[in-house]
Amino acid sequence: QQAPYWTHPQRMEKKLHAVPAGNTVKFRCPAAGNPTPTIRWLKDGQAFHGENRIGGIRLRHQHWSLVMESVVPSDRGTYTCLVENAVGSIRYNYLLDVLERSPHRPILQAGLPANTTAVVGSDVELLCKVYSDAQPHIQWLKHIVINGSSFGADGFPYVQVLKTADINSSEVEVLYLRNVSAEDAGEYTCLAGNSIGLSYQSAWLTVLPEEDPTWTAAAPEARYTD
C-alpha cells in the first residue's frame, strides 16, 4: 500500500493562472497510489461541483483534471485538488485570476531594438521589449535583397525569419548575433503579434571592418547608437 503522490509535479508548477475572461482553464493534479486514489475539487475551501456555474465544469477523473470553459470574474478563487486513498491524502492549490482588461495589440518599448554598430568578429545583442495582455508571438526578421531588390512587386520588403518565440508578457526578447560579418549588416525587425494584431519596430546593424582605426582595443564589442 502507498499513500497518494504526484506523478508529474513539473506539470503543476504554474500555481497562478491569470487568464482573460472567456478563455478555458484546465487544472491538473496527476497522481497515483495504492489503492488508486480518488480526486475531489474545492473552490475557496468548499466542495466544488460547478452547479452554479454557467456552462458547468468538466471533471475527468482519469486525467485528474478540472476544466472550466468561458471563465468569468466570478470564477476567480483558489481551486484545490484533494487526492486521497485509505493510506493518506495530498492537496494542491491553484489560484485563478480572470482578467477583464481590454486586450490590445502588442506594445513595443520605444527605441528597441536600437541601431547598433559592431566590428567584424564581435557579438551583438538586439533587444525587443514587448508588452501584451494576450500572449505575444515574437519573430525576428532580417530584411534581405533578392535579385538586387529589397522590395517585391507588391511594394513590400523581402524578409527572412531568423527566430520565432512565444514569450510571457513584459519579457525581453533577445536576438543574439555571434561573430558578425559584413553580411550581417542591414535592417532587423522585431515583430510581435497577438490575437488582436501585429506591431513591429526595426533597427540597423552597421558592421565595421576589424582594422577600422576608430575602434580601439579598449572599445566595447558593440556600440549602441540612436
Epitope: 472567456g22 495589440r105 520605444a110 519573430q139 520588403p157 525569419v161 497577438n194 490575437s195 501585429l198 513591429y200
Partner: antibody, heavy 124, light 112 residues
Framework: EVQLLESGGGVVQPGRSLRLSCAAS????????MHWVRQAPGKGLEWVAV????????YYADSVKGRFTISRDNSKNTLSLQMNSLRVEDTAIYYC?????????????????WGQGTMVTVSS | DIVMTQTPLSLSVTPGQPASISCTSS???????????VYWYVQKSGQPPQLLIY???NRFSGVPDRFSGSGSRTDFTLKISRVEAEDVGVYYC?????????FGGGTKVEIK
C-alpha cells in the same frame, strides 16, 4: 483563392443553442487569428469574439461573454462559434473574418477577408 | 471600450462630385509603433463589408485611387474624390487597436 464560408445558421427559440462553423480555404489557416462579427437586421456591425492562431487566447464582447464559445480545429481549417442561452437580440448575420497572421504583413494585418455570413434568427 | 462616432448618417452625392465621411474615436488610435489603426469598409446591399483603407491611409489592393483616408489620433476622414454609381453603400470606420473592436454607426451613400 482565399475564402471563408459560414454555415449553421437558422431559426431557434430563445434559451436554445446553435453552433456556427466557418470553413477556410486558400490560406494557411493555422497561422491566423480569426474573428466573428455580427450584424443585426438593418443595423451596424458588432464584433463578437476572436481566437488566436493556436486557440490559446480567446476574447469576447461583453454582450456574449459566458454564453458564446469560440473554438477552432486547425487540422480541419474550421472556426466555430458555440452559442448557448440565445436571446432575441442575438438575431443577426454572423460573419467569419480573418485576423492577424504570423509574420511580416504584406498589407493589412487582418480584417481583410470576410465570409458571406450566415443568418441566425432567435424567435419564439 | 473605444467609441467610434461617424458623420453624417447619410449622404446624397451627384456622380463625379466629391464626398467626405468623418469618424471620431473616443481615444487615440495612434499606436506605439507609429501606425494609426483605423480601417474603412464599404458594405453594398446583400454583401459582407469590403475593406477599402487600412492603417489610416493605405488603400487595400484593388481599391480605386479615388478613395483616400486621412486624419490623426482621434479624427479621421474618408474621401471619395469623384463619386461613381458603384460607390453606393454603407461606409463604416473601425478601430483595430484593442478589443472589443468597434465600428462606427455607418454612413449611407446614395446617388442623386
Amino acid at each position: 483563392e482565399v475564402q471563408l464560408l459560414e454555415s449553421g445558421g437558422g431559426v431557434v427559440q430563445p434559451g436554445r443553442s446553435l453552433r456556427l462553423s466557418c470553413a477556410a480555404s486558400g490560406f494557411t489557416f493555422s497561422s491566423y487569428a480569426m474573428h466573428w462579427v455580427r450584424q443585426a437586421p438593418g443595423k451596424g456591425l458588432e464584433w463578437v469574439a476572436v481566437i488566436s492562431y493556436d486557440g490559446s487566447n480567446k476574447y469576447y464582447a461583453d454582450s456574449v461573454k459566458g454564453r458564446f464559445t469560440i473554438s477552432r480545429d486547425n487540422s480541419k481549417n474550421t472556426l466555430s462559434l458555440q452559442m448557448n442561452s440565445l436571446r432575441v437580440e442575438d438575431t443577426a448575420i454572423y460573419y467569419c473574418v480573418r485576423g492577424a497572421g504570423l509574420g511580416y504583413p504584406n498589407g493589412p494585418d487582418g480584417f481583410d477577408i470576410w465570409g458571406q455570413g450566415t443568418m441566425v434568427t432567435v424567435s419564439s | 471600450d473605444i467609441v467610434m462616432t461617424q458623420t453624417p448618417l447619410s449622404l446624397s452625392v451627384t456622380p463625379g462630385q466629391p464626398a467626405s465621411i468623418s469618424c471620431t474615436s473616443s481615444r487615440s488610435l495612434l499606436h506605439s509603433d507609429g501606425k494609426t489603426y483605423v480601417y474603412w469598409y464599404v458594405q453594398k446591399s446583400g454583401q459582407p463589408p469590403q475593406l477599402l483603407i487600412y492603417e489610416l491611409s493605405n488603400r487595400f489592393s484593388g481599391v480605386p485611387d479615388r478613395f483616400s483616408g486621412s486624419g490623426s489620433r482621434t479624427d479621421f476622414t474618408l474621401k471619395i474624390s469623384r463619386v461613381e454609381a458603384e460607390d453606393v453603400g454603407v461606409y463604416y470606420c473601425m478601430q483595430y487597436i484593442e478589443a472589443p473592436l468597434t465600428f462606427g454607426g455607418g454612413t449611407k451613400v446614395e446617388i442623386k
